[in-house]
C-alpha cells in the first residue's frame, strides 16, 4: 500500500519516483541486525526525506533510519523477524510511499572471506577453500555459494560453480596450463530465509603449473 502526500507544499514531491529497495543483514554485529534502504533513482533529492519502519518490532512500534550519504540504515536488536514491517519514505509526518516487507525475505549475507587456492601435486587438482561468518550464526546458517573463476586474460568468461559447502576441488585438467586465474565467491540464503547475493569476496589469484604429462594435453575449460 502506498500513501501519497496531499499537502500543496509537497506537490513537487508527488511528481518524483520514490521507489526504493532494502536488504537486511541478521546478526551482523553480534546479536544486532541491520536494515539498509536506498532509492532506486540516484537523482532523487533526498534532502528532506526520511525512512521509517513500523510493525514487527520488539518493544517499539516504529524506528527511524539514519541517513548515511545516499543510503538509509538501521542497526538494532529490535527486529521481531516474524511478520511484515511497513517501511515508509516520509517528508515530515507525511508518507510518500510504503512497502510491507518481511525482513527475513530480503536477507543479504555477509561476503565470504579468506578465499584461498592450494595446488595438490599428487592429486593434480586445486583445493579452493573460503570462510563465512554465517557458520557461527543462529539464523542465516545455510547458504548457497557461487564460486566464479576465469583466466585473467578472459575479461568476461567466468565459470560458475554452485555449492553448499565452503570447499571446492578444481581438476587441473579442466584448467589451462601455465595460466593466471582469478577466483572469487559470493553467497545467498538457501534455507528458510530468502534474499539477495552477498557482495563478492576479495579475488584470489593463482597460477596453474606447466604441462608435465607425456601426452602434453589438457582438457579445455
Amino acid at each position: 500500500e502506498s500513501g501519497y502526500a496531499q499537502n500543496g507544499d509537497l506537490e513537487d514531491a508527488e511528481l518524483d519516483d520514490y521507489s526504493f529497495s532494502c536488504y537486511s543483514q541478521l546478526e551482523v554485529n553480534g546479536s544486532q541486525h541491520s536494515l539498509t534502504c536506498a532509492f532506486e533513482d540516484p537523482d532523487v533529492n533526498i534532502t528532506n526525506l526520511e525512512f521509517e519502519i513500523c510493525g514487527a518490532l520488539v518493544e517499539v512500534k516504529c524506528l527511524n533510519f539514519r541517513k548515511l550519504q545516499e543510503i538509509y540504515f538501521i542497526e538494532t536488536k529490535k527486529f521481531l523477524l516474524i511478520g511484515k514491517s511497513n517501511i515508509c519514505v516520509k517528508v515530515g509526518e507525511k508518507s510518500l510511499t510504503c512497502k510491507k516487507i518481511d525482513l527475513t525475505t530480503i536477507v543479504k549475507p555477509e561476503a565470504p572471506f579468506d578465499l584461498s587456492v592450494v595446488y595438490r601435486e599428487g592429486a593434480n587438482d586445486f583445493v579452493v577453500t573460503f570462510n563465512t561468518s554465517h557458520l557461527q550464526k543462529k539464523y542465516v546458517k545455510v547458504l548457497m555459494h557461487d564460486v566464479a573463476y576465469r583466466q585473467e586474460k578472459d575479461e568476461n568468461k567466468w565459470t560458475h560453480v554452485n555449492l553448499s559447502s565452503t570447499k571446492l576441488t578444481l581438476l587441473q585438467r579442466k584448467l589451462q596450463p601455465a595460466a593466471m586465474y582469478e577466483i572469487k565467491v559470493r553467497s545467498i540464503p538457501d534455507h528458510y530465509f530468502k534474499g539477495f547475493w552477498s557482495e563478492w569476496s576479495p579475488s584470489y589469484y593463482f597460477r596453474t603449473p606447466e604441462i608435465n604429462n607425456s601426452s602434453g594435453e589438457m582438457d579445455p575449460i
Partner: antibody, heavy 117, light 110 residues
C-alpha cells in the same frame, strides 16, 4: 476471501495425543505467519503458538511448551498442531489464525478438543 | 511478562456509546500495537481494530480504537450501539513473539 478450516479435534484420554490441521485458502499462505489460539469452555482466548512463513521461527506459550509442536506444509497450504501428553485443562476450542500484513488477524471456525477419561 | 486487564462487562442502550478499556500491567502500552477482536456467541473472533486504531475493511466506523499513555491503556469505543454489537471483546498485544490477550469484556446492549 480468506478461509481457514480446522479439523482433527475430538475426544481423547488424558496422556493421549492428537494432531490438528488447518486448511488455508484465499490468501498467499507461504508468506503468512500462522498462529494457534484456544478457548476453554466459557473462558477467554489463550494464545498457544506461532510459526513463521517458512517454518524456521516457532514460538510457544509456557503452558504448552514441550508438549505441543506447530508446523506447516506450504506445498499443501496446511498448518498443523501436534498435541502430546494431553491434560483435562487442554479441553477447548482450538482456532488457527492468520496474522495479516500487520496484526489484523483472520480466524478459522475452530475445532473442539475434549480431554477426558 | 505483562497482562492486559479488561472490565468483565459493560452495557449500553441502543444508539448510545460505550468504551472498553484494556490496561497493560507493566511496560508501556506504546511499545507494541493493540488489536481488538469481537466474538459473537457461538462464533469465532473477528478483528475490529488493529494497530491501535486501524479498522479492517467492512468494520463500521462506529468502532474506533485509541491509546492513552497516561493511563497505560488502550480503549475500544463503539458509538451508535446496535443489538448486533452484543458480544465479547478482547484486546491483544505482543510480548516479544508471544500474543497476549486481555480477559475479555462482555458487552450487553440493553
Amino acid at each position: 476471501q480468506v478461509n481457514l478450516r480446522e479439523s482433527g479435534g475430538g475426544l481423547v484420554k488424558p496422556g493421549g495425543s492428537l494432531r490438528l490441521s488447518c486448511a488455508a485458502s484465499g490468501f498467499t499462505f507461504d508468506d503468512s505467519v500462522m498462529h494457534w489460539v484456544r478457548q476453554a469452555p466459557g473462558k477467554g482466548l489463550e494464545w498457544l503458538s506461532l510459526v513463521g512463513w517458512d517454518g524456521f521461527f516457532t514460538y510457544y506459550a509456557d503452558s504448552v511448551k514441550g508438549r505441543f509442536t506447530i508446523s506447516r506444509d506450504n506445498t499443501k497450504n496446511l498448518l498443523y498442531l501436534q498435541m502430546n501428553s494431553l491434560r483435562a485443562e487442554d479441553t477447548a476450542v482450538y482456532y488457527c489464525a492468520r496474522q495479516g500484513d500487520y496484526m489484523g488477524n483472520n480466524w478459522g471456525q475452530g475445532t473442539l478438543v475434549t480431554v477426558s477419561s | 511478562n505483562f497482562m492486559l486487564t479488561q472490565p468483565h462487562s459493560v452495557s449500553g442502550s441502543p444508539g448510545k456509546t460505550v468504551t472498553i478499556s484494556c490496561t497493560r500491567s507493566s511496560g508501556s502500552i506504546d511499545s507494541s500495537y493493540v488489536q481488538w477482536y469481537q466474538q459473537r456467541p457461538g462464533n469465532s473472533p473477528t478483528t475490529v481494530i488493529y494497530e491501535d486504531d486501524q479498522r479492517p475493511s467492512g468494520v463500521p466506523d462506529r468502532f474506533s480504537g485509541s491509546i492513552d499513555s497516561s493511563s497505560n491503556s488502550a480503549s475500544l469505543t463503539i458509538s451508535g450501539l446496535v443489538t448486533e454489537d452484543e458480544a465479547d471483546y478482547y484486546c491483544q498485544s505482543y510480548d516479544f513473539h508471544h500474543l497476549v490477550f486481555g480477559g475479555g469484556t462482555k458487552l450487553t446492549v440493553l
